[in-house]
Amino acid sequence: QAGPLPKPTLWAEPGSVISWGNSVTIWCQGTLEAREYRLDKEESPAPWDRQNPLEPKNKARFSIPSMTEDYAGRYRCYYRSPVGWSQPSDPLELVMTGAYSKPTLSALPSPLVTSGKSVTLLCQSRSPMDTFLLIKERAAHPLLHLRSEHGAQQHQAEFPMSPVTSVHGGTYRCFSSHGFSHYLLSHPSDPLELIVSGSLEDPRPSPTRSVSTAAGPEDQPLMPTGSVPHSGLRRHWE
């Protein structure tokens, strides 16, 4: 007896973080024997969507012409072959930005910092939120969460970095969110350029170098040391 059908591959184009109102296409790739593809969304009635395969039958396209809150969430896909349904794909998390007004990102005491010193990035929202995310451009794993304990609402989150080295330099943005949906984020803050000076022994990497998809030095800025701030927020690294 044959084993279970191999699980399909699920991905989104142009990516899995989509601004409100923009289009996104979800692709599910199975095998040439696929007769039908099914997409399920976590915590929603199933099936979320069904599509016939595109020739040569090894994948299907699920189109979202205009991103809204309804489409944000965690998806899996399956395909049906003559011998039955496949295993589910690995999950795809589709995140929508633009659900809330943009926060403000600032650096204390200054965005110009000397190597070896300390700096704190401060993300502030106009309305109270319970999750804040810091994004560093071109980082392999760019998300750092600060989530409040017990659902307490905060107007700001602090991201301390100490001691600062040259790899902390770069462009940052932050987002805010409510805990009831981790898939709905605010508009991004305006970018903040953190400039690290006075480091000869630790030169900054060339800005034109290719981005690695594996963990590496570019991840280090998002792992600040020090205790969790007194704001009641708990730190999560992803």
């Epitope: 969304k41 929603s44 009635p45 199933a46 099936p47 979320w48």
Partner: nanobody
Framework: EVQLVESGGGLVQAGGSLRLSCAAS????????MGWYRQSPGHQRELVAA???????KIGDSVKGRFTISRDNAKNTVYLQMNSLKVEDTAVYYC???????????????WGQGTQVTVSS
């Protein structure tokens, strides 16, 4: 061939209850979200409730706490239990089937003929 057949509509007093049924062909019932829409004169068609093959449900805001939806897999039938009915619940109720994303777009793949529910004061 009629693939969705509704029953159970009628006239009821405000505060009363009704249970609508929708029988579907096995091929449709086993692979689709089943749900109910309603439409009253001068109003757009509104999603009342839906239930997936995974048992998860979506209930419209205007009927939350009063209406429940369930599906009987052995009978290929979906039920809408309507309690504490109000005059404003008066409408033609349509059974529908399709992928859930089609319900969000108000365009399920299959529709019944509709059954009239009238709530009097």
């Amino acid at each position: 061939e009629v693939q969705l057949v509704e029953s159970g509509g009628g006239l009821v007093q405000a505060g009363g209850s009704l249970r609508l049924s929708c029988a579907a062909s096995e091929s449709i019932f086993s692979s689709n979200v089943m749900g109910w829409y309603r439409q009253s004169p001068g109003h757009q068609r509104e999603l009342v409730a839906a239930v997936g093959i995974n048992g998860l449900t979506k209930i419209g805001d205007s009927v939350k706490g009063r209406f429940t939806i369930s599906r009987d897999n052995a009978k290929n039938t979906v039920y809408l239990q309507m309690n504490s009915l109000k005059v404003e619940d008066t409408a033609v109720y349509y059974c529908a089937a399709g992928a859930y994303v089609r319900f969000l777009q108000n365009s399920p793949d299959y529709w019944g003929q509709g059954t009239q529910v009238t709530v009097s004061s």
